[in-house]
Interface confidence: medium
């Protein structure tokens, strides 16, 4: 409530940015040249979900792994390629809606 003698005006409800509450960790091999792919995916994700938290970590040889809210959803070591943007964005949509996450199995070769 406001100070005595002042009129309290309820603030408008906070607008929740799309992707708020979803945390992504991308672990990738920098010497392998995977940084460009990470930046490309991170940019696409941020565009769709500005409220998302993305943190990158350096990984071992050949690594390109994506975790959403602590769950591994993509591993280059398992899949051989890189995820499609649309598949990652769909996984984030599911996570932000509280739906069950499934591993991304489709992959594309590096550009």
């Amino acid at each position: 409530s406001g100070e005595p003698g002042q009129t309290s005006v309820a603030p408008p409800p906070e607008e929740v940015e799309p992707g708020s509450g979803v945390r992504i960790v991308v672990e990738y091999c920098e010497p392998c040249g995977f940084e460009a792919t990470y930046l490309e995916l991170a940019s696409a994700v941020k565009e769709q979900y500005p409220g998302i938290e993305i943190e990158s970590r350096l990984g071992g040889t050949g690594a390109f792994e994506i975790e959403i809210n602590g769950q591994l959803v993509f591993s280059k070591l398992e899949n051989g390629g890189f995820p499609y943007e649309k598949d990652l964005i769909e996984a984030i949509r599911r996570a932000s809606n509280g739906e069950t996450l499934e591993k991304i199995t489709n992959s594309r070769p590096p550009c």
Epitope: V25, P31, G59, N69, Q71
Partner: antibody, heavy 125, light 107 residues
């Protein structure tokens, strides 16, 4: 060899201020995510906060007990990390360590691999 | 903040023993956990990162395991140099947090 050297510790009265410095050598400092960790006498380690590299946004994060009172900054031209401590309380008495929280190089991957020797801050009237 | 709970607080053992320290996170942190060793008057030193990866130069008698919320550090065949305090630290969250520590002392 990577080296981190803290300075600026000392005795200060409750409510007072102090600025700690941490000079870093042996790495490209501008690429490093730097952290401060403290340890009260006879107690465990407590993470204080962290500043990302400028290329990663240069943003800061703080532990709840120090948020709003402590400010982490960096001067990449001087290879130096700072911790500005205001409104100090007796419970801020501790050894303060600076450390590399993440370094953009394959030789430093996770956690905190390199620490300084620590500088002692005593808050007492 | 993510709370990290270590047990036991103190552990008494003899040279040659095998000991295990556990660390529990208040929520899933995947495998983003590090273990540190600290000796009196010294800065901590990282032993293990990403739950089970041994830091370069750390003896192979140290090993880590776990994922999600439950983690452990095992020291096989304790050496005199291993008596110290051990801490776990999560780095899943932007706000890093440590366990309260486990003091390993000579029985």
């Amino acid at each position: 060899e990577v080296q981190l050297v803290e300075s600026g510790g000392g005795l200060v009265k409750p409510g007072g201020s102090l600025r700690l410095s941490c000079e870093v050598s042996g790495i490209t400092f501008s690429n490093a995510w730097m952290s401060w960790v403290r340890q009260a006498p006879g107690k465990g380690l407590e993470w204080v906060g962290r500043i990302k590299s400028k290329t990663d946004g240069g943003t800061t994060d703080y532990a709840a007990p120090v948020k709003g009172r402590f400010t982490i900054s960096r001067d990449d031209s001087k290879n130096t990390l700072y911790l500005q401590m205001n409104s100090l309380k007796t419970e801020d008495t501790a050894v303060y360590y600076c450390s590399i929280g993440y370094y953009y190089d394959s030789s430093f991957k996770y956690g905190m691999d390199v620490w300084g020797q620590g500088t002692t801050v005593t808050v007492s009237s | 903040d993510i709370q990290m709970t270590q047990s036991p607080a103190t552990l008494s053992a003899s040279v040659g023993d095998r000991v295990t320290i556990t660390c529990r996170a208040s929520q899933s942190i995947s495998r983003w956990l590090a273990w540190y060793q600290q000796k009196p008057g010294q800065a901590p030193k990282v032993l293990i990162y990403k739950a089970s990866t041994l830091q370069s130069g750390v003896p192979s008698r140290f090993s880590g395991s776990g994922s999600g919320t439950e983690f452990s550090l095992t020291i096989n065949s304790l050496q005199p140099d291993d008596f110290a305090t051990y801490y776990c630290q999560q780095y899943y969250s932007y706000l890093r947090t440590f366990g309260q520590g486990t003091k390993l002392e000579i029985k």
